[in-house]
């Protein structure tokens, strides 16, 4: 496939309260179950409808979970990670990495490799500049009428 797929990588702290149906999401990954090549991290594979995570709205399928209640999820067996979530208590703090796909060239898919991202300002600055130019041109056009 031609073109390069880049990602905007942002991190967020998400505090969930375990609801009547639990935290309400599934995970994949771990040292014994790599979801992304060369990455044994823990990823969200499914969010349960009307569960705590879905109602909160911030956690997304494909997000990488970096820590649970301050405990790092690096180099964990899959089941050890599962147990960590299950025993995390009523109030659960998640450090999460979101990856927003930024398309360069032909349309691709959300890849399972290359976790590299680009800084948010590299996208926002040109967008802001274009918006300002468009607004200026529009005002000039209206003045000429």
């Amino acid at each position: 496939m031609n073109g390069r797929v880049d990602y905007l990588v942002t991190e967020e702290e998400i505090n969930l309260t375990r609801g009547p149906s639990g935290l309400g999401f599934n995970i994949v990954g771990g040292t014994d179950q790599q979801y992304v090549s060369n990455d044994s991290g823990i990823y969200v594979s499914r969010i349960k409808e009307n569960g705590a995570a879905a109602l909160d709205g911030r956690l997304q399928e494909g997000d990488k979970i970096l820590s649970v209640n301050g405990q790092d999820l690096k180099n964990l067996l899959h089941q050890d990670a599962v147990d960590l979530f299950r025993n995390a208590g009523y109030a659960v703090s998640l450090r999460v990495q979101h990856r927003l796909q930024v398309q360069n060239g032909p349309i691709g898919h959300r890849g399972e490799g290359d976790p590299s991202g680009i800084p948010i300002f590299m996208v926002l600055v040109p967008v802001f500049a274009l918006t300002m130019v468009a607004a200026w041109a529009f005002m000039r056009y209206r003045q000429q009428l």
């Epitope: 009547p20 149906s21 999401f25 995970i27 994949v28 179950q33 594979s45 899959h78 599962v82 979530f85």
Partner: nanobody
Framework: QVQLVESGGGLVQAGGSLRLSCAAS????????MGWFRQAPGLERDFVAE????????GYADSVKGRFTISRDNAKNTVYLQMNSLKPQDTAVYYC?????????????????????WGQGTQVTVS
């Protein structure tokens, strides 16, 4: 997509045994949590048992603990439910189910909303 086909149901006398099988096609069951549910006429679909992707962790409904055993063979892409000491109240249509990943909650919380892929069911009747 994952396609699931159950087999092994039938008519059995109280106290007897049955072994249900669920064969998956379309995708390997690695990374999938597998479960069994059952539905009696006019009632909701209830959780019976589930097994983690590796087979290392299992969970059961209180009503079947000590009588039913769930297992899996990832090489054969198949999940099993061994049912012993069957009771008339075990009569139902039994469904196999699959979902990607591992739920971050214990199976006490489990409902049909936790699973995405379903078989067509196999009837179990205990007389």
């Amino acid at each position: 997509q994952v396609q699931l086909v159950e087999s092994g149901g039938g008519l059995v006398q109280a106290g007897g045994s049955l072994r249900l099988s669920c064969a998956a096609s379309g995708r390997t069951l690695m990374r999938y949590t597998m479960g069994w549910f059952r539905q009696a006429p006019g009632l909701e679909r209830d959780f019976v048992a589930e097994i983690s992707w590796s087979g290392g962790n299992t969970g059961y409904a209180d009503s079947v603990k000590g009588r039913f055993t769930i297992s899996r063979d990832n090489a054969k892409n198949t999940v099993y439910l061994q049912m012993n000491s069957l009771k008339p109240q075990d009569t139902a249509v039994y469904y196999c189910a699959a979902v990607i990943g591992s739920p971050t909650d214990y199976s006490d919380y489990r409902s049909s909303l936790d699973y995405d892929y379903w078989g067509q069911g196999t009837q179990v009747t205990v007389s």
